[in-house]
């Protein structure tokens, strides 16, 4: 049901990496445009982006209010320059989204290595904290301060002269491995999540090796 | 339900190849990593060496590097271990384990193996 | 790459007793070590991981614990369905590394 020429917004999906969160939806409209609206289970409805065009929605500001809420989302279609009509039930047509909890879903971005020291035959590796749109007392809060001990990096590492990667694991930013001496090694960072069960890894962070910019060598 | 199951063993002669499969379910491998395990007839655990599908990195025990090569297809949730130039000591039931990538990485779900005779 | 050395590698217990295990790493590695069991026939399942956590659906009378390079299993009360080989497993570097086993027989 609904009004003339008004179609409900279909395939509602989720985007949302380190709590940057878009609602995405299709149609591109014909004639009609959209309103938004977002609630927690218990919580009442917030409209937002009012009669767009467009078929996104950045939900972030709301989401980033408690990332370990679940939030429902509902996509109202409205038809162009004609906003007050109903659908044939009497309220506008609208589409319902799945179920978003934050914490659990949110992609892990691409981590970066910030830094790495080799010390001897030991090294350094220092992942960058990212920062995240989630705020507590006016601060951004970083990866970790959201996620705690929940996140953990890995780290690949090999000489590059091979081809097999070893790995080393933190539940901080830094990792300190053993390394031969006169080798020069090359690393990779991944974020993981291992208490999800989906969306539990980032993509790899660029290849840093040592003899380029980021590293630091002392005796 | 999360399996894994291993599949592809058999009797091979001194020199010869052979490809174990490890069909996962449950859960996508690229979101783990996948490890070989084997153990000769009798003895304890050897790690042959591990995957991260996500990325295609690999590592090997030294007694198998250059011989062994393990691959995974993401799209048939399946993880490989093709074993080229094969010696008897090579004879052992294989096992492919799930590593959780926790800090302490324990393999948390194995398959139930498959055996690989190594004979003339 | 570091060994893990583990004693006894055999030992005879009778069903009620306490029993230790324990594994030495050649070097540090953290709390980074797990503990399986193996039955004959069947691959390993995971008891312990991180050293000392119970993994889930594994019975409280196993325990893990750590002190330094030192790594010990634990079975409070021997029951029937105990015995089996037991091994550590360190995941701190690559290679990850097994012990020897411990082979836990009735006596």
């Known amino acids: 049901s609904g009004t003339t020429n008004t179609v409900a917004a279909y395939n509602l999906t989720w985007k949302s990496t380190n709590f940057k969160t878009i609602l995405e939806w299709e149609p591109k409209p014909v004639n009609q445009v959209y309103t938004v609206q977002i609630s927690t289970k218990s919580g009442d409805w917030k409209s937002k982006c009012f009669y767009t065009t467009d078929t996104e929605c950045d939900l972030t500001d709301e989401i980033v209010k408690d990332v370990k809420q679940t939030y429902l989302a509902r996509v109202f279609s409205y038809p162009a320059g004609n906003v007050e009509s109903t659908g044939s039930a009497g309220e506008p047509l609208y589409e319902n989204s799945p179920e978003f909890t934050p914490y659990l879903e949110t992609n892990l971005g691409q981590p970066t290595i910030q830094s790495f020291e080799q010390v001897g035959t030991k090294v350094n590796v220092t992942v960058e904290d990212e920062r995240t749109l989630v705020r507590r007392n006016n601060t951004f809060l970083s990866l970790r301060d959201v996620f705690g001990k929940d996140l953990i990096y890995t780290l690949y590492y090999w000489k590059s002269s091979s081809s097999g990667k070893k790995t080393a694991k933190t539940n901080t930013n830094e990792f300190l491995i053993d390394v031969d001496k006169g080798e020069n090694y090359c690393f990779s960072v991944q974020a993981v999540i291992p208490s999800r069960t989906v969306n539990r890894k980032s993509t790899d962070s660029p290849v840093e090796c040592m003899g380029q910019e980021k590293g630091e060598f002392r005796e | 339900e999360v399996q894994l199951v291993e599949s592809g063993g058999g009797l091979v002669q001194p020199g010869g190849s052979l490809r174990l499969s490890c069909a996962a379910s449950?859960?996508?491998?690229?979101?783990?990593?996948i490890h070989w395990v084997r153990q000769a007839p009798g003895k304890g655990l050897e790690w042959v060496g591990y995957?991260?599908?996500?990325?295609?990195?690999?590592y090997y025990a030294d007694s198998v590097k250059g011989r062994f090569t393990i691959s995974a297809d993401t799209s048939k949730n399946t993880a490989y271990l093709q074993m080229n130039s094969l010696r008897a000591e090579d004879t052992a039931v294989y096992y492919c384990?799930?590593?959780?990538?926790?800090?302490?990485?324990?393999?948390?779900?194995w398959g139930q193996g498959t055996l690989v005779t190594v004979s003339s | 790459d570091i060994q893990m050395t583990q004693s006894p590698s055999s030992l005879s217990a009778s069903v009620g007793d306490r029993v230790t295990i324990t594994c030495r790493a050649s070097?540090?590695?953290?709390?980074?070590v797990a503990w399986y069991q193996q039955k004959p026939g069947k691959a390993p399942k995971l008891l312990i991981y991180?050293?000392?956590f119970l993994y889930s659906g594994v019975p409280s009378r196993f325990s893990g614990s750590r002190s330094g390079t030192d790594f010990t299993l634990t079975i409070s009360s021997l029951q029937p369905e105990d015995f089996a080989t037991y091994y550590c497993?360190?995941?701190?570097?690559?290679?990850?590394?097994f012990g020897q086993g411990t082979k836990v027989e009735i006596k």
């Open positions: 995957i991260d599908p996500s990325n295609g990195y690999t």
């Open positions: 070097q540090d590695v953290n709390t980074a």
């Open positions: 384990a799930r590593d959780d990538q926790s800090v302490s990485s324990p393999f948390d779900y």
């Open positions: 449950g859960f996508n491998i690229s979101d783990y990593n």
């Open positions: 991180s050293a000392s």
């Open positions: 497993q360190q995941h701190y570097t690559t290679p990850p590394t």
